[in-house]
């Protein structure tokens, strides 16, 4: 058993049929010594008496709010949550496996630049009685500070018969050094509580590996005289790290016909312009990637040829 926050405790349980559970000692936070009784949640049944109480916790019916009383007055509360371990593996019932980039990916994180700011998100089908708390650091043995905000519901989607809820959080490394080579990874830890169930999820990464630039901005076409060719130009996204001479991007320019089956013409360039042939009803799209490190491509920025 360990304390998650004031008066909230997590009991770690091996979860199998007829498991004996854990013996937990509860102490009433009071200077009183005598006449103390204990109840669980809203039950009128008295569980026991005394300043300390030893209880057996083996299922969710044993979790909840334990209250000590004296003469009708509430003295203190202890909320017990359960963290289940089945076959040596902690339960992951609350969050959905996103399966990208690999199985058992519950947290996904991205950064738009090297400033030390990043966003993580996760999915669940649970809509109520759900709370999240996020902590982060760089390194784990001698951790350096990363400050995370509150997790917020960022999207709702319908997936077949189920509704899916996306939560996200923004974090900022306290003393980020954008140009430095990373040697210790960022660690992100999410505590999830659904009703009386506790779970925790972690992710470990280097900022360089989760970089995904915003799409190029100000995408423009300039027809070339007496030609089917156009000059496509764009700019670095505002959110990308500066100076651009050091934090450089490379670009992919694509000409795509109206039909998805039509052949795509692609050009790769380090410049912020390219000359392509603009077919009727086609569109031109440009995306960006860090020039010196193969992290994710940005989403496409697009304009129609016409």
């Amino acid at each position: 058993i360990w304390e998650l926050k004031k008066d909230v405790y997590v009991v770690e349980l091996d979860w199998y049929p007829d498991a004996p559970g854990e013996m937990v000692v509860l102490t009433c936070d009071t200077p009183e010594e005598d006449g103390i009784t204990w109840t669980l949640d809203q039950s009128s049944e008295v569980l026991g008496s005394g300043k300390t109480l030893t209880i057996q916790v083996k299922e969710f019916g044993d979790a909840g709010q334990y209250t000590c009383h004296k003469g009708g007055e509430v003295l203190s509360h202890s909320l017990l949550l359960l963290h289940k371990k089945e076959d040596g593996i902690w339960s992951t019932d609350i969050l959905k496996d996103q399966k990208e980039p690999k199985n058992k990916t519950f947290l996904r994180c991205e950064a738009k630049n090297y400033s030390g700011r990043f966003t993580c998100w996760w999915l669940t089908t649970i809509s109520t009685d759900l709370t999240f708390s996020v902590k982060s650091s760089r390194g784990s043995s001698d951790p350096q500070g990363v400050t995370c905000g509150a997790a917020t519901l960022s999207a709702e989607r319908v997936r077949g018969d189920n509704k899916e809820y996306e939560y996200s959080v923004e974090c900022q490394e306290d003393s980020a050094c954008p140009a430095a080579e990373e040697s210790l990874p960022i660690e992100v830890m999410v505590d999830a509580v659904h009703k009386l169930k506790y779970e925790n999820y972690t992710s470990s990464f280097f900022i360089r590996d989760i970089i995904k630039p915003d799409p190029p901005k100000n995408l423009q076409l300039k027809p070339l005289k007496n030609s089917r060719q156009v000059e496509v130009s764009w700019e670095y996204p505002d959110t990308w790290s500066t100076p651009h001479s050091y934090f450089s991007l490379t670009f992919c320019v694509q000409v795509q016909g109206k039909s998805k089956r039509e052949k795509k013409d692609r050009v790769f360039t380090d410049k912020t312009s390219a000359t392509v042939i603009c077919r009727k009803n086609a569109s031109i799209s440009v995306r960006a990637q860090d020039r010196y490190y193969s992290s994710s491509w940005s989403e496409w920025a697009s304009v129609p040829c016409s």
Epitope: G21, T37, E45, V46, L47, G48, S49, I55, Q56, V57, K58, E59, G61, D62
Partner: nanobody
Framework: EVQLVESGGGLVQPGGSLRLSCAAS????????MYWVRQAPGKGLEWVST???????ASADSVKGRFTISRDNAKNTLYLQMNSLKPEDTALYYC????????RGQGTQVTVSS
């Protein structure tokens, strides 16, 4: 009619063990909160241990790690396994359907003495 009949008490030396039984009739133990309480000579009733309908237990600090409450649903019987007995465990032991011991049996005497 609800009946609770305790048995298994006796005289035992310090450090010894006893197993108390409580045969219940007129109701099913498995759906009930059940308690062991005791009354030492010249003292009031003292709570010892509780078993909830789900089989989970609670016990007083004074008996922690020494006494174990359990039940056999098929026999509709409640038990108290008492190990490492001390002279201060000497008391009349009752099984009860309520914490205050209002609905209890006639009790079984446990005396711990050398």
């Amino acid at each position: 009619e609800v009946q609770l009949v305790e048995s298994g008490g006796g005289l035992v030396q310090p450090g010894g063990s006893l197993r108390l039984s409580c045969a219940a009739s007129g109701f099913t133990l498995s759906g009930s909160w059940m308690y062991w309480v005791r009354q030492a000579p010249g003292k009031g009733l003292e709570w010892v241990s509780t078993i909830k309908p789900n089989g989970s237990t609670a016990s007083a600090d004074s008996v922690k790690g020494r006494f174990t409450i359990s039940r056999d649903n098929a026999k509709n019987t409640l038990y108290l396994q008492m190990n490492s007995l001390k002279p201060e465990d000497t008391a009349l032991y009752y099984c009860a359907r309520d914490f205050s011991g209002n609905q209890r049996g006639q009790g079984t005497q446990v005396t711990v003495s050398s």
